[in-house]
């Protein structure tokens, strides 16, 4: 807190301008009127106040708006946003995408801070859902944003917003998140033709069920190994050798390098060795010829 001291003669600020950067903290406190600051917030970001000077300006706004800043002030906070705590931000009602963009710009190039996370949370809750424009904006600033959401939060993403998602936006998503996103992507891209559909759906396939993988295997998609390795193990296990061969196309040779890793390892254990031998890759660990395979899970389900 800056001590309350009288403003020196001739130093009372009549407008927010560059001369104020030479004011000491106590002079800013004494000589800058909070109402003037609020009405001229658009000028603050054009003036290179230091981090310590911003403390004083924030203190003034806090006194003027104890219940939270109006959006007219918020949209012009600029670097002052860096001074806000999550508690401050929870008092705000941010409805404009332009305001959100302006504040995200200040934090550009940095990790998502607790302040930014709180701001986004307030904004999305205020909108009721994560619409395409918002998602476009958020993933542009934070490619990992989608994967920071819980499956419950992701359920509010409308399928139309999926068009905004780029492959790199899903890099850090776990299977639970992809389970939620995949059906939305399938719906969003359903009217595309085979090859175009596969290009769009590919990064979501970590949430695909067996029947969809079987269907893809009939479409000459030539899935790369990196995508295959991200598939759900439970979705890959029921695929036959022939289906995996069709699914991977020329990339099938890559199975050898991955034979000790999931899901390839587990899939090999479920295949007949003589079926695996037809691939000519030297994959080992399949069910020896002459052995009978009982699917106990199916038996339990029937009983």
């Amino acid at each position: 807190e800056v001590e309350k001291t009288a403003c020196p003669s001739g130093k009372k600020a009549r407008e927010i301008d560059e001369s104020l950067i030479f004011y000491k903290k106590w002079e800013l406190e004494a000589c800058v009127d909070a109402a003037l600051l609020a009405t001229q917030m658009d000028r603050v970001n054009a003036i290179p106040f230091t981090y310590e000077q911003l403390d004083v300006l924030k203190h003034k706004l806090d006194e003027l708006y104890p219940q939270g800043y109006p959006e007219s002030v918020i949209q012009h906070l600029g670097y002052l946003f860096l001074k806000m705590s999550p508690e401050d931000i929870r008092k705000w009602n941010v409805t404009s995408l332009e305001t959100l963009k302006a504040l995200l710009e200040v934090n550009k190039g940095h990790e998502m801070s607790p302040q930014v996370a709180t701001l986004i949370d307030r904004f999305v809750k205020g909108r009721g859902q994560l619409d395409k424009d918002t998602l476009d904006t958020l993933t542009a600033f934070y490619p990992g944003y989608l994967c920071s959401l819980s499956p419950e939060e992701l359920s509010s993403v409308p399928p139309s917003s999926i068009w905004a998602v780029r492959p790199q936006d899903l890099d850090t998503c776990d299977p639970r998140q992809l389970d939620v996103l995949y059906p939305k992507a399938r719906l969003a891209f359903q009217n595309m033709n085979g090859s175009e559909y596969f290009v769009k759906i590919q990064s979501f396939l970590g949430g695909a069920p067996t029947e969809d993988l079987k269907a893809l295997s009939q479409q000459n998609v030539s899935m790369d190994l990196a995508t295959f390795m991200k598939l759900r193990t439970d979705a890959v296990l029921p695929l036959t050798v022939a289906e995996v061969q069709k699914l991977l196309g020329p990339h099938v040779e890559g199975l050898k390098a991955e034979e000790r890793h999931r899901p390839v390892r587990d899939w090999i254990l479920r295949q007949r060795q003589d079926d695996l031998d037809t691939l000519g890759l030297g994959l080992q660990g399949g069910i020896p010829n002459g052995y009978l395979v009982l699917d106990l899970s199916m038996q339990e389900a029937l009983s």
């Epitope: 950067i21 030479f22 903290k25 054009a46 290179p48 230091t50 981090y51 310590e52 000077q53 860096l82």
Partner: antibody
Framework: QVQLVQSGAEVKKPGASVKVSCKAS????????MHWVRQAPGQGLEWMGM????????IYYEKFQGRVTMTVDKSISTAYMELSRLRSDDTAVYYC?????????????WGQGTLVTVSS | DIVMTQSPDSLAVSLGERATINCKAS??????VAWYQQKPGQSPKLLIY???TRHTGVPDRFTGSGSGTDFTLTISSLQAEDVAVYFC?????????FGAGTKLEIK
């Protein structure tokens, strides 16, 4: 990478003016305040002022007010610092420098410096 | 204006030994202090900011500490390439001001 390339050394007579240039590359010229700092022989560093290339806003340290003029030419990403009514104690190396985050005014990148000698 | 007083003016330290440079501000500047290294014939290079945060690529033998009015730059094990003049700078308020510099040499 960010580069600030300054003009060559100058020798001036007392009372004359000098104009030093600083050509920027490797970043968006209009994004950051350009500062000027000088260093007299064997002395410390002294901040002179700054200019924002996008708005042409200038802020001068009052010690140099009335004698210094900072300008930019956006078309060639170049900043200029002109100091008039030169005195012998203006003999110094003049540096341009940029600050990436204005609220944290530490000097992230510097030009190589321009030696200005004021001598009769 | 905030005056930054550096000490000592010069310092001679043996290779591998610790070097300590001090800087005192005339008013509290919080942790708004940066340190620069200037080798002969070169422009200054940023080493430390926020009093203790190392700039990208700066070796971890350089350590900054302090807050308020007293600040220290420490080089834990002096290397030949550390011979230079070191400056502190406050950025709590304008005008930005620097210390007069400490010349570091090898004993």
């Amino acid at each position: 990478q960010v580069q600030l390339v300054q003009s060559g050394a100058e020798v001036k007579k007392p009372g004359a003016s000098v104009k030093v240039s600083c050509k920027a590359s490797g970043y968006t010229f209009t994004s950051y305040w350009m500062h000027w700092v000088r260093q007299a022989p064997g002395q410390g560093l002294e901040w002179m002022g700054m200019i924002h290339p996008n708005s042409d806003n200038t802020i001068y340290y009052e010690k140099f007010q009335g004698r210094v003029t900072m300008t930019v030419d956006k078309s060639i990403s170049t900043a200029y610092m002109e100091l008039s009514r030169l005195r012998s104690d203006d003999t110094a190396v003049y540096y341009c420098a940029i600050i990436i985050t204005p609220v944290v005014p530490k000097f992230d990148y510097w030009g190589q410096g321009t030696l200005v000698t004021v001598s009769s | 204006d905030i005056v930054m007083t550096q000490s000592p003016d010069s310092l001679a330290v043996s290779l591998g030994e610790r070097a300590t440079i001090n800087c005192k501000a005339s008013h509290s500047v919080g942790t708004s202090v940066a340190w620069y290294q200037q080798k002969p014939g070169q422009s200054p290079k940023l080493l430390i900011y926020w009093a203790s945060t190392r700039h990208t690529g700066v070796p971890d033998r350089f350590t900054g500490s302090g807050s308020g009015t007293d600040f220290t730059l420490t080089i834990s094990s002096l290397q030949a390439e550390d011979v230079a003049v070191y400056f502190c700078q406050q950025y709590s308020s304008y005008p930005l001001t620097f210390g007069a510099g400490t010349k570091l040499e090898i004993k």
